[in-house]
């Protein structure tokens, strides 16, 4: 009761910013922890289809909104054909995975590679074959696949015909696509992600116009898109839960991304309130309906009365609890450029440990998969990516502290990314891969960077040994 009165939000994530040592859950005294991760900790690495596959119109693949956006909005980028060409060089990706020794590989299926116009009819045979071959190869290697159904590459036909995620017609179309994937791949996939970082889909796709489809300044559309993404996710979860989980025995979630923020004045309750509001407006927007009470955060409902859609009581009941674990993304896409609306005049921070503590407090200590984490280097950096190692060590140390000192239930970690590739609005100006790829080369060899060697060692030792 008191918390609602003070902050206007139902959870108690505010405690994170309290500098009272008896109150704040994060003990800052342990700056670096030499320790191991829990036994059977799930180590993995990830990619997004549009970022690495290339072959944007090869073998019957249909165009996506990003293929279109690249040609119309991004200067100096001819297409994702340059990319790492994972569609052609599947074996090279598998060798890279073998080199690192991961327990899982998180990748996304390109919806238009399976269904060129987005509608589930007869699948594109070459696309189906590619993903089937990849899954078989992973199973053979004892690498668990974590499969994302939607990592931003909406079939262009659905954008042009329906207006994309602005139109709730797409909810059923997405569910049909998901059903097909469960039917065809579910025997080999135990972990599913419906949508990767819906916040960025809505905010940058329809607010800033920095992402496809490049619409700008329509806050009503931003929140309508968010609403439809949540409902689509929920529908797919219920579908999986009812029709596929009983025999496939898998888990399904949605990857939610966020920044982290610190108050200008740690003793100032209104600065703390602004930090809470900031987290709620980004992470809470999607986490509250799915991992919380089934509705949007109270503060959002009050402030955004003219643009935020309303969930009926039945819908709230339907949304609530539609994730089997909390899949969390913490990386540069949520930091640069940061929505100034979310910044609230406070200080952005890369403290993953505190973000995990906030999730623990707000959403009743869920099991957490770090579904994307890492940083970036300038495109000129080749294999000596010392900054990436520094950032990885820092992030992993924070995850370990969260597990060991704060009793947060993180069960897996996805380093991002396996390969250098197409980095959305940054195109090819930055690199996020643990493997270097020369985009101008014919063979697109995957060369392990220093960070790949480092991550391999972390996995082998299951943490940091003295």
């Amino acid at each position: 009761i008191l918390l609602r009165a003070v902050t206007g939000f139902s959870g108690d994530g505010r405690a994170i910013w309290s500098k009272n040592p008896n109150f704040t859950p994060v003990n800052e005294s342990q700056l670096f922890l030499y320790d191991t991760f829990p036994k059977n900790f799930f180590w993995g690495i990830g990619t997004g289809a549009l970022q690495v596959e290339g072959s944007w119109k090869k073998d019957g693949k249909g165009p996506s909104i990003w293929d279109h956006f690249i040609h119309t909005h991004l200067k100096n980028v001819s297409s994702t054909n340059g990319s790492s060409d994972s569609y052609i060089f599947l074996e090279k990706d598998l060798s890279a995975l073998d080199f690192i020794g991961v327990s899982f590989y998180q990748f996304s299926i390109s919806w238009p590679r399976l269904f060129p116009d987005g509608i589930v009819t007869v699948a594109n045979a070459k696309g189906l074959q590619y993903y089937s071959t990849l899954l078989d190869a992973l199973v053979l290697r004892n690498i668990e696949p974590i499969v994302t159904l939607y990592h931003w590459d909406l079939p262009l036909a659905l954008q042009e015909k329906y207006g994309g995620w602005k139109n709730d017609t797409i909810i059923d179309i997405f569910n049909d696509y998901a059903t097909y994937c469960f039917q065809m791949f579910g025997d080999r996939v135990k972990y599913w992600i419906t949508i990767h970082n819906p916040y960025l889909v809505a905010w940058h796709g329809y607010g800033t116009g920095m992402h496809a489809p490049g619409e700008k300044g329509n806050l009503a559309a931003v929140y309508t898109v968010g609403h439809n993404l949540i409902k689509a996710h929920s529908k797919v979860w219920h579908n999986y839960n009812t029709h596929f989980r009983p025999h496939q025995k898998g888990w399904l979630s949605i990857t939610l991304g966020s920044h982290w923020i610190e108050p200008n004045r740690s003793e100032n309750t209104m600065d703390i309130f602004k930090c809470q509001q900031s987290m709620v407006s980004v992470l809470g927007w999607f986490a509250n309906p799915i991992h919380g009470d089934g509705d949007y955060p109270e503060g959002m409902r009050k402030k955004l009365f003219s643009v935020l859609p309303i969930f009926s009581e039945a819908e709230k009941h339907e949304m609530r609890g539609t994730a089997d674990f909390f899949a969390f993304s913490f990386g540069p896409n949520n930091f640069k450029p940061l929505n100034t609306m979310a910044k609230m005049g406070q200080n952005v921070s890369l403290n993953l440990r505190e973000a995990l503590n906030w999730i623990k407090l707000e959403y009743n200590n869920p099991r957490i998969l770090i579904a994307e984490n890492g940083w970036f280097t300038d495109s000129r950096v080749k294999t000596e990516d010392t900054t990436a190692i520094y950032m990885m060590k820092n992030f992993l140390s924070q995850v370990l502290q969260a597990i060991r000192l704060d009793e947060i239930r993180v069960f897996g970690y996805t380093a991002w990314s396996l390969l250098d590739g197409f980095e959305w609005q940054d195109a090819y100006t930055i690199r996020r891969g643990l493997f270097y790829v020369d985009f101008n080369s014919k063979q697109k060899e995957r060369k392990p960077k220093s960070s790949a060697h480092y991550y391999k060692q972390i996995i082998r030792e299951n943490g940091f040994s003295l």
């Epitope: 009165a5 902050t7 300044g217 329509n218 009050k302 402030k303 643009v307």
Partner: antibody, heavy 119, light 107 residues
Framework: QVQLVQSGAEVKKPGASVKVSCKAS????????INWVRQATGQGLEWMGW????????GYAQKFQGRVTMTRDTSINTAYMELSSLRSEDTAVYYC????????????WGQGTMVTVSS | DIQMAQSPSSLSASVGDRVTITCQAS??????LNWYQLKPGKAPKLLIY???NLETGVPSRFSGGGSGTDFTFTISSLQPEDVATYYC?????????FGPGTKVDIK
């Protein structure tokens, strides 16, 4: 800097309609709702409703439903509020105000337009 | 509709005095309360949002507090330019509603 400049004073007869304009500058007009608030002589402030300049969507206070229409012309960054079936108690200063989503508050206001309803 | 009451309806104080206005909501509005200043013939001005957040450029002598149903607005040291009518406003529920205002002048 952000400015909302409203049209001049109006004198209307009972039963007539009045249309007040509000020209915005200094920010992206389509990114923030315009709300209308009035103040009758010697009274407090009374909220009339909102209009989203991007979509044209509107929401009106129950009291004004059926009598008020809020529109916009994005080509000239101008919002309009039309009140019909005027009566003497509609005599008031009418303000347009930019709504700040972050604050849940009206962070910039027009200078007001005096509307007098008299026979 | 949520009713907002303000007291006093008017007050006179000397320059340098501490002035406090109260605002009461007819139901719990949490922290969804703003304060505005209105001077005759001028555009209203946002002073405080979400109970106690000072809008950029507003002097620090203005402050706000409270939560739930009872709120206060304080001018720590009254200045001649503060002569105006002050309004509280809730946005916990539609329709948005304002208090009746408190007129402040100099003795």
């Amino acid at each position: 800097q952000v400015q909302l400049v409203q049209s001049g004073a109006e004198v209307k007869k009972p039963g007539a309609s009045v249309k007040v304009s509000c020209k915005a500058s200094g920010y992206t007009f389509t990114s923030y709702d315009i709300n209308w608030v009035r103040q009758a002589t010697g009274q407090g402030l009374e909220w009339m409703g909102w209009m989203n300049p991007h979509s044209g969507n509107t929401g009106y206070a129950q009291k004004f439903q059926g009598r008020v229409t809020m529109t916009r012309d994005t080509s000239i960054n101008t919002a309009y509020m039309e009140l019909s079936s005027l009566r003497s108690e509609d005599t008031a200063v009418y303000y347009c105000a930019k709504y700040n989503w972050n604050y849940g508050a009206f962070d910039f206001w027009g200078q007001g337009t005096m509307v007098t309803v008299s026979s | 509709d949520i009713q907002m009451a303000q007291s006093p309806s008017s007050l006179s104080a000397s320059v340098g005095d501490r002035v406090t206005i109260t605002c009461q909501a007819s139901q719990d509005i949490s922290i969804y309360l703003n304060w505005y200043q209105l001077k005759p013939g001028k555009a209203p001005k946002l002073l405080i949002y979400d109970v106690s957040n000072l809008e950029t450029g507003v002097p620090s002598r203005f402050s706000g507090g409270g939560s739930g149903t009872d709120f206060t607005f304080t001018i720590s040291s009254l200045q001649p330019e503060d002569v105006a009518t002050y309004y509280c406003q809730q946005y916990d529920n539609l329709p948005l509603t304002f208090g009746p205002g408190t007129k402040v002048d100099i003795k």
